[in-house]
Interface confidence: medium
C-alpha cells in the first residue's frame, strides 16, 4: 500500500525574513480527496516531526515552527501525497534551509523632499512573527547594503543603480523637475542572499523645489 | 544602440590637466544627470562628479573639489570634466554615466548606461 501513489515531484523552500514557506508541485492525476503530510528535519535533531497530516493546499507557512533559523544550522522538509489509506513517499528538499536560502526584503521605503533633495529612509522589515530580539538589524548587524533604482517618468529607459550602505540617503534634485519613482533591492555584503526589489515609491517635483548647490 | 563614450584620457605629469568628453548615440542626454566615477586598480569603484541634466547643479567628491569641473553642452550631446592639478591618485579609469539624479553619498555600483572608460595616469 505505501508506494501505490506517486511523490511530490519537487519540494522547495521559498522564504523572506519571518516568512518560511514551503511550497511542492502536486502529484499527476491526484484525486479530490488528495492531501500532503509535512515533516521537518532540524539540524542536530535527526528525527523527523510531523507538522501537518492531511494540507490541500500546495504550500504550508513552516514560519512558526522554525522562528530559530537565524540562530540554527538550518532545516530539512519533506512532503508526501496521501489519499485514504494510501500514501506515497517522500519527497525531501534538495538543500538545506538555512538562513542563506532567505530572500531579502525592505519593509518600505519613504520619501520626502527637504533642501533640494530627495530624502529616503528605508524602512526594514518588521515581521509580526519576529521574536523581539530578532530585529532584521540584530540579525544583519554587519555590511547591510541596498541597491536604489531611480526611474525618471515619463522616461522608457534609464535607471540610475546606485549602493547605499546606510538606510539612509540622499538623491539630489537641483535642476529637476518631474516624476522620479525609487525601488531599492536589500544585500548583505557578507553573505550570499539573494534580494527582492521594493515596490516602486515615486515623488514629484517642481519647480519650487529649485536650488543651486555646488 | 544607446551607448555612451568617454574620450580625452592620456598620461600627464603631476600638476598637469586633461579634459574628458563623455558623449552619447542612440538617445539625448538632456533629460538626464550625468555621472563620472573612476576605478584605480584594485580599489573599489567611486563617484567623482556628477551634473544635474540642466547643467544648475553640480556636485563633487572631497578629494577633486577646486580641482574638477565638469559642465555639459546639451546642443553637442556631450557632457565634460576638466580636470586640473592632477595628482598621481588620480590615475584611474574615467567613466560617464546617464543617471535619472545624482545622488550623494554613494558609489555606482552598475548596471545602466555608462561607457567603456577612459585611462587617466598621472605620473612623472
Known amino acids: 500500500h505505501g508506494t501505490e501513489l506517486p511523490s511530490p515531484p519537487s519540494v522547495w523552500f521559498e522564504a523572506e525574513f519571518f516568512h518560511h514557506i514551503l511550497h511542492w508541485t502536486p502529484i499527476p492525476n491526484q484525486s479530490e480527496s488528495t492531501c500532503y503530510e509535512v515533516a521537518l528535519l532540524r539540524y542536530g535533531i535527526e528525527s523527523w516531526n510531523s507538522i501537518s497530516n492531511c494540507s490541500q493546499t500546495l504550500s504550508y507557512d513552516l514560519t512558526a515552527v522554525t522562528l530559530d533559523l537565524y540562530h540554527s544550522n538550518g532545516y530539512r522538509a519533506r512532503v508526501r501525497a496521501v489519499d485514504g489509506s494510501r500514501h506515497s513517499n517522500w519527497t525531501v528538499t534538495n538543500t538545506r534551509f538555512s538562513v542563506d536560502e532567505v530572500t531579502l526584503t525592505v519593509g518600505s521605503v519613504n520619501l520626502e523632499i527637504h533642501n533640494g533633495f530627495i530624502l529616503g529612509k528605508i524602512q526594514l522589515p518588521r515581521p509580526k512573527m519576529a521574536p523581539a530580539n530578532d530585529t532584521y538589524e540584530s540579525i544583519f548587524s554587519h555590511f547591510r547594503e541596498y541597491e536604489i533604482a531611480i526611474r525618471k517618468v515619463p522616461g522608457n529607459f534609464t535607471f540610475t543603480h546606485k549602493k547605499v550602505k546606510h538606510e539612509n540617503f540622499s538623491l539630489l534634485t537641483s535642476g529637476e523637475v518631474g516624476e522620479f519613482c525609487v525601488q531599492v533591492k536589500p544585500s548583505v555584503a557578507s553573505r550570499s542572499n539573494k534580494g527582492m526589489w521594493s515596490k516602486e515609491e515615486c515623488i514629484s517635483l517642481t519647480r519650487q523645489y529649485f536650488t543651486v548647490t555646488n | 544602440d544607446l551607448q555612451l563614450v568617454e574620450s580625452g584620457g592620456g598620461l600627464v605629469q603631476p600638476g598637469g590637466s586633461l579634459r574628458l568628453s563623455c558623449a552619447a548615440s542612440g538617445f539625448t542626454l538632456d533629460s538626464y544627470a550625468i555621472d563620472w566615477f573612476r576605478q584605480a586598480p584594485g580599489k573599489e569603484r567611486e563617484g567623482v562628479s556628477c551634473?544635474?541634466?540642466?547643467?544648475?547643479?553640480?556636485t563633487y567628491a572631497d578629494s577633486v573639489k577646486g580641482r574638477f569641473t565638469i559642465s555639459r553642452d546639451n546642443a553637442k550631446n556631450t557632457v565634460y570634466l576638466q580636470m586640473n592639478s592632477l595628482k598621481p591618485e588620480d590615475t584611474a579609469v574615467y567613466y560617464c554615466a546617464a543617471a535619472a539624479l545624482c545622488m550623494s553619498g554613494t558609489y555606482y555600483a552598475g548596471p545602466g548606461y555608462w561607457g567603456q572608460g577612459t585611462q587617466v595616469t598621472v605620473s612623472s
Open positions: 551634473i544635474s541634466s540642466s547643467g544648475i547643479s553640480t
